[in-house]
């Protein structure tokens, strides 16, 4: 009986967290559009969690369409987003792993995980729901992947999804991939402005970490991400104190957001501009 078969699998705590999208449009299905051209393009497949090739007809379609594999990865895969910095020669933890647990100023009661540098382990804490710092993970697995010492120091940050062999559940499979950048400050302040998927045009503000300022954008009314504020004041209060760090082979470079010439910022400017 298929119902009984379904009961036999245990999904353990080594399971990686479900996919979190950088941009809501990355979830759209590839759409070739109504025209008849044959153009090689790339889209992000939410089920394989990879950028894949498709043939675009040349008109209409949707935003999940990129001219190159690299552009697709940059916009839709997590190792190019608000996570960690690593080079293949580096095995040190991101700096935010050494921050103390910070519940923030709000009064939610959300279970989160932080890396405790005293015990060298990820531990549970109660997060208030806003502000705090980046030593704050939704799952124990994510915390361990990023902050605890692994066999080679690399972070698990690229996911592929498979359905579990016995009980049909969608279980992400990990690939160990070194990531590039590290951010400090509330993590949602570092995400690009995201209109969301609906059709309204509401005036909102988002924090542009490239230029270190709060900028207006049009919100569709649903979806999107937490980098979304109803006033400029609210945006500044939540995000202005953050800064970006970059680790290169030469060590740590701290850069205040106002300086515009850093290469790390140029790379991210593309994301912010293209998303608008």
């Amino acid at each position: 009986d298929s119902e009984e078969d379904e009961e036999h699998t245990i999904i353990t705590d080594t399971e990686l967290p479900p996919l979190k999208l950088m941009h809501s449009f990355c979830a759209f299905k590839a759409d070739d559009g109504p025209c008849k051209a044959i153009m090689k393009r790339f889209f992000f497949n939410i089920f394989t969690r990879q950028c894949e090739e498709f043939i675009y007809g040349g008109c209409e379609g949707n935003q999940n369409r990129f001219e190159s594999l690299e552009e697709c990865k940059k916009m839709c895969t997590r190792d190019n987003a608000n996570r960690i910095i690593k080079t293949t020669l580096q095995q040190e933890k991101p700096d935010f792993c050494f921050l103390e647990e910070d519940p923030g100023i709000c009064r939610g009661y959300i279970t989160r995980y932080f890396y405790n540098n005293q015990t060298k382990q990820c531990e549970r804490f109660k997060y208030g729901g806003c502000l705090g710092n980046m030593n704050n993970f939704e799952t124990l697995e994510e915390c361990k992947n990023i902050c605890e010492d692994g066999p080679n120091g690399f972070q698990v940050d690229n996911y592929g999804t498979q359905l579990n062999a016995v009980n049909n559940s969608l279980t992400p499979q990990s690939t160990k991939v070194p990531s590039l950048f590290e951010f400090h400050g509330p993590s949602w302040c570092l995400t690009p402005a995201d209109r969301g998927l609906c059709r309204a045009n509401e005036n909102r503000f988002y924090y542009n970490s490239v230029i270190g300022k709060c900028r207006p954008f049009k919100y569709s009314g649903c979806g999107g991400n937490e980098n979304n504020f109803t006033s400029k004041q609210e945006c500044l209060r939540a995000c202005k104190k953050g800064f970006i760090q970059r680790i290169s082979k030469g060590g740590l470079i701290k850069t205040k957001r106002k300086r515009k010439k850093q290469r790390v910022k140029i790379a991210y400017e593309e994301i912010f501009v293209k998303n608008m």
């Epitope: 999208l21 759209f28 697995e141 969608l170």
Partner: antibody, heavy 122, light 108 residues
């Protein structure tokens, strides 16, 4: 074992309230978005509501908006559906389901409970 | 808002191929999932993302989706495949999950 078990169903009068619970086990509950789906006797499946893994986003079918509230307690691995102002047409088996693979609505429900029957009748 | 339409019933002889359709405006641009539900039981996911088969689901189940129609195909239908089948998609315009009306598959 991966399991969802609904409870709290029963007979209630029109205009009354009921709170359904769904106990999850065998997976990292606080990583997954969850759904309620219902099925009226002899009818098809009807989506009721979704909630994101950290409760920050909730979504409702038009037919229940303003009357039903979805919530979750990740510390207890439990999903809830508070149903107020119940109507005869809310009579159904209510299933809780896990959104497999990701938070986004594009993902399917890969794990389902066995359902709990709610009967609204005078 | 997208609406999904399924035939109320489909009949097939054992060993033959059953095809269950699900139609909706421009449905090919949406991801479609299929669920099997046997009497008195919860639904079971049999196809996700148009054409992906969960492990544990027999290879005879497959899916396709283009134009205005998604199709669930069961090759070499067996008696235990007799069940109700539902297609499902996600309407991103109003952030709602939409099910088809269901198709009762009868294995003659």
């Amino acid at each position: 074992q991966v399991q969802l078990v609904e409870s709290g169903g029963g007979l209630v009068q029109p205009g009354g309230s009921l709170r359904l619970s769904c106990a999850a086990s065998g997976f990292t509950f606080n990583s997954y978005a969850m759904s309620w789906v219902r099925q009226a006797p002899g009818k098809g499946l009807e989506w009721v509501s979704n909630i994101s893994s950290n409760s920050s986003n909730t979504y409702y079918a038009d037919s229940v908006k303003g009357r039903f509230t979805i919530s979750r307690d990740n510390s207890k691995n439990t999903l809830y559906l508070q149903m107020n102002s119940l109507r005869a047409e809310d009579t159904a088996v209510y299933y809780c389901a896990r959104k497999g693979g990701g938070e986004h609505g594009f993902f399917p429900s890969d794990i389902w409970g066995q359902g709990t029957l709610v009967t609204v009748s005078s | 808002d997208i609406e999904l339409t399924q035939p109320p019933s489909v009949s097939v002889a054992p060993g033959q191929t059953a095809r269950i359709s699900c139609s909706g405006d421009n449905l090919g641009t949406y991801y479609v999932h299929w669920y099997q539900q046997k009497p008195g039981q919860a639904p079971v996911l049999v196809i996700y993302g148009d054409n992906n088969r969960p492990s544990g689901i027999p290879e005879r189940f497959s899916g396709s989706n283009s134009g205005n129609t998604a199709t669930l195909t069961i090759s070499g239908t067996q008696a235990e495949d007799e069940a109700d089948y539902y297609c499902q998609t996600y309407d991103s315009n109003n952030e709602s999950i939409v099910f088809g009306g269901g198709t009762k598959l009868t294995v003659l």
